[in-house]
């Protein structure tokens, strides 16, 4: 199986009550605007076939996509939470910049691509859904990377 390196985040990143609260508030506000509750982006299909040691690398890909393709285009919305949460998530992304796996990551890219395709297919409502799942992104990053 591919070996992951530098795929770790310090626990302290997730022990800051203020930014944790702001992230969850942002997710709550966006999910109240999400009318497509049948679809879940961060769920079993995303992680299927991915080993424990690869989970953080997968979440790095999801985090980067969320920052670049979802949060930046929607940066004017959901204030004041957005202006605080985006820099926090960007710091986490930066911390994972050296997170790689040695070997084939095609199965991971396939899973992440399905998430990306779902968001793109749903258009703006897909972006809102992704923001509404920032609580799951936060927790999944934590669980996979600490």
């Amino acid at each position: 199986a591919p070996v992951s390196s530098h795929c770790r985040l310090d626990k302290s990143n997730f022990q800051q009550p203020y930014i944790t609260n702001r992230t969850f508030m942002l997710a709550k506000e966006a999910s109240s605007a999400d009318n497509n509750t049948d679809v879940r982006l961060i769920g079993e299909k995303l992680f299927r076939g991915v080993s424990m040691s690869e989970r953080c690398y997968l979440m790095k890909q999801v985090l980067n996509f969320t920052l670049e393709e979802v949060l930046l285009p929607q940066s004017d919305r959901f204030q004041p939470y957005m202006q605080e949460v985006v820099p926090f998530l960007a710091r986490l992304s930066n911390s994972l910049s050296t997170c790689h796996i040695e070997g084939d990551d095609l199965h991971i890219q396939k899973n992440v691509q399905k998430l990306k395709d779902t968001v793109k297919k749903l258009g703006e409502s897909g972006e809102i859904k992704a923001i509404g799942e920032l609580d799951l992104l936060f927790m999944s990053l934590r669980n996979a990377c600490i």
Partner: antibody, heavy 119, light 112 residues
Framework: EVQLVESGGGLVQPGGSLRLSCAVS????????MIWVRQAPGKGLEWIGI???????YYASWAKGRFTISRDNSKNTVYLQMNSLRAEDTAVYYC?????????????WGQGTLVTVSS | AVQLTQSPSSLSASVGDRVTITCQAS??????LAWYQQKPGKAPKLLIY???TLASGVPSRFSGSGSGTDFTLTISSLQPEDFATYYC??????????????FGGGTKVEIK
């Protein structure tokens, strides 16, 4: 339909060994981690260990050294090898699929197989 | 290792009653908590995960809440098929892998 069926339980003497099997159907075993959990008569659930997709294993501290989990994806089967069995190992042993959704959840479970350790 | 304390250990209730079961963790487990239902002689069945997300096929009378150290499972209107034992389960990451998964002691819901 997703199914897990445990087998191999029975009566064994203290100090003896037993190998339990968990045969799965309705899903691709190679895509999931699998866990073993036990339940002593009238007691609660106790995690034994987990085997990851690529075969890495992690055990509860009390199970290390005596219990070994393995898998054979080609046979759609997960195993629990139990050695140096004691009376307190008497329990129903369950296997379950680990569905990671950002957090580990165990679903579904097999029906269990009873192991009785007694002389 | 995290300890999960469920209360009460047993309770008697009638059909139609609102039932609340609590699970207290000895350390912060965020929302990494699941609830399982087990009927006599049967395997456990997943009810709730992420502390409050209903598993597929689970009736909406079941709900979960809480985060950190205090969690609650509520059955809004108890049905005959709900008489069972309920277990909470925590997943803990970043510590030793030998204590990653922990179950509470269980709460038995009996007919009054």
């Amino acid at each position: 339909e997703v199914q897990l069926v445990e087998s191999g339980g029975g009566l064994v003497q203290p100090g003896g060994s037993l190998r339990l099997s968990c045969a799965v159907s309705g899903f691709s075993l190679s895509s999931y981690a699998m866990i073993w959990v036990r339940q002593a008569p009238g007691k609660g659930l106790e995690w034994i260990g987990i085997i990851d997709i690529e075969g890495s294993t992690y055990y509860a501290s009390w199970a290390k050294g005596r219990f070994t989990i393995s898998r054979d994806n080609s046979k759609n089967t997960v195993y629990l090898q139990m050695n140096s069995l004691r009376a307190e190992d008497t329990a129903v042993y369950y296997c379950a699929r680990d569905r990671f959704v950002g957090v580990d959840i165990f679903d579904p479970w097999g029906q269990g197989t009873l192991v009785t350790v007694s002389s | 290792a995290v300890q999960l304390t469920q209360s009460p250990s047993s309770l008697s209730a009638s059909v139609g009653d609102r039932v609340t079961i609590t699970c207290q963790a000895s350390e912060d487990i965020y929302t990494n908590l699941a609830w399982y239902q087990q009927k006599p002689g049967k395997a456990p069945k997943l009810l709730i995960y992420w502390a409050s997300t209903l598993a597929s096929g689970v009736p909406s009378r079941f709900s979960g809440s809480g985060s950190g150290t205090d969690f609650t499972l509520t059955i809004s209107s108890l049905q005959p098929e709900d008489f069972a034992t309920y277990y909470c389960q925590a997943s803990v990451y970043g510590n030793a892998a030998d204590s990653r998964y922990t179950f509470g002691g269980g709460t038995k819901v009996e007919i009054k």
